[in-house]
């Protein structure tokens, strides 16, 4: 039985062996930061960790969600002061007893190495340096984003 | 009260630089956009650029060849340096605060006239 | 870029009457549009973003109305304070540009 994740990842595959790709010939909206297939934007004001998630998801995106420690780098490096952290779309999940994106995956501890402890109530921020565990509650930034939609053509034999 | 502050030369010389500073009071730049804006004399508004407190920027265009906008967290600052001017440069220049999707200036400076002759 | 045309260029209107000012967007900006208000030897000042929403300190009479490419700024009843120069603004496109703008003049 797939869960509704692992029939909409499969549905993506079969979807993309029938066409071809020219990713980034979609802009990002107005303000949002583009970063490879992605488009970022930084928040102004602070938030604890669930207000963040409802915020990105007015605005049709979601918190963060890192790939893998090369995208990290890359969003880091975006961050001018080093003073400031972002929430990212992590937090521990106390029934797994594991950190869990909120696409429902779970981190791979060789992804990201956080500072801090994994427990209840505990959420993900980013700075320009370093991973920390936070308390959810905790009034900071955040970072959400968009995936850049690549503009695909069917492929018709002989064309 | 927040309030933005324009300081540079009132007169530069054709082909020269034009460099301008906008220091930020009552609220720190690690925050929203800043963005340069000029005003010929007579005439309307036109956006040069901005710059985003992460340190990214965004330039006009028709400017863009010719604009450097800088960030100075420190003294809660930024600049606009606008090279190899011409009198079409001549212009009243007003720092402000963009608030990006949430839409609008809603903090400027006063202006400051910069004159381009010899 | 995004051609902002506003109508009329100036506007000759009474104290205590109603002024309607126009916007025209060459392409469709959605709601992303502000207006300013902007008076001899000073900076604009916000008056309207997202096209209806007032700036904090903007006095009820100033209302705005529109999206895709058609806004308007309405002065309910005009006070001596409101004769000024008035901006629209777009925000859905770079670059960000503003309209010539409109001159209300005391009739």
């Known amino acids: 039985q797939k869960s509704s994740i692992e029939k909409c990842s499969v549905d993506i595959q079969q979807s993309r062996n029938k066409t071809t790709e020219r990713p980034g010939l979609l802009n990002c909206p107005i303000y949002w930061q583009q970063l490879r297939e992605k488009c970022l934007l930084f928040s102004h004001t602070v938030n604890p960790w669930n207000n963040s998630l409802a915020d990105c998801s007015t605005k049709e995106s979601s918190l963060l969600l890192i790939r893998d420690k090369d995208e990290l780098i890359h969003t880091q490096n975006l961050i001018r002061d080093k003073a400031i952290l972002f929430w990212i779309g992590l937090n521990f999940s106390l029934s797994e007893k594991n950190w869990k994106w909120i696409n429902g995956s779970f981190l791979n501890s060789n992804d990201l190495e956080i500072r801090g402890d994994a427990k209840e109530n505990s959420c993900i921020s980013i700075s320009q340096t370093s991973v920390y565990s936070e308390y959810c509650s905790t009034e900071i930034r955040w970072i959400c984003q968009k995936e850049l939609t690549p503009v695909r053509n069917k492929v018709y034999p002989d064309s | 009260q927040v309030q933005l502050q324009e300081s540079g030369p009132g007169l530069v010389k054709p082909s020269e630089t034009l460099s301008l500073t906008c220091t930020v009071s009552?609220?720190?730049?690690?925050?929203?956009?800043w963005s340069w804006i000029r005003q010929p004399p007579g005439k309307g508004l036109e956006w040069i650029g901005y710059?985003?407190?992460?340190?990214?920027?965004n330039y006009n265009p028709s400017l863009k060849s010719r604009v450097t906008i800088l960030l100075d967290t420190s003294k809660n600052q930024f600049s606009l340096k606008l090279s190899s001017v011409t009198a079409a440069d001549t212009a009243v220049y007003y720092c402000?605060?963009?608030?990006?999707?949430?839409?609008?200036?809603?903090?400027w400076g006063q202006g400051t006239l910069v004159t381009v002759s010899s | 870029e995004i051609v902002m045309t506003q109508s009329p260029a100036s506007l000759s209107v009474s104290p205590g009457e109603r002024a309607t000012l126009s916007c025209r967007a060459s392409?469709?900006?959605?709601?992303?549009l502000a207006w300013y208000q902007q008076k001899v030897g000073q900076a604009p000042r916000l008056l309207i973003s997202?096209?209806?929403t007032r700036a904090t300190g903007i006095p009820a009479r100033f209302s705005g109305s529109g999206s895709g490419t058609e806004f308007t700024l309405t002065i309910s009843s005009l006070q001596s304070e409101d004769f000024a120069v008035y901006y629209c603004?777009?925000?859905?496109?770079?670059?960000?540009?503003f309209g010539g703008g409109t001159k209300v003049e005391i009739k």
């Open positions: 009552a609220v720190s730049i690690n925050s929203y956009y």
């Open positions: 710059i985003y407190y992460i340190g990214t920027t």
């Open positions: 603004q777009q925000y859905n496109n770079w670059p960000l540009t």
């Open positions: 392409q469709s900006v959605s709601s992303s």
């Open positions: 402000a605060r963009d608030l990006g999707i949430e839409g609008g200036f809603d903090y």
């Open positions: 997202g096209a209806s």
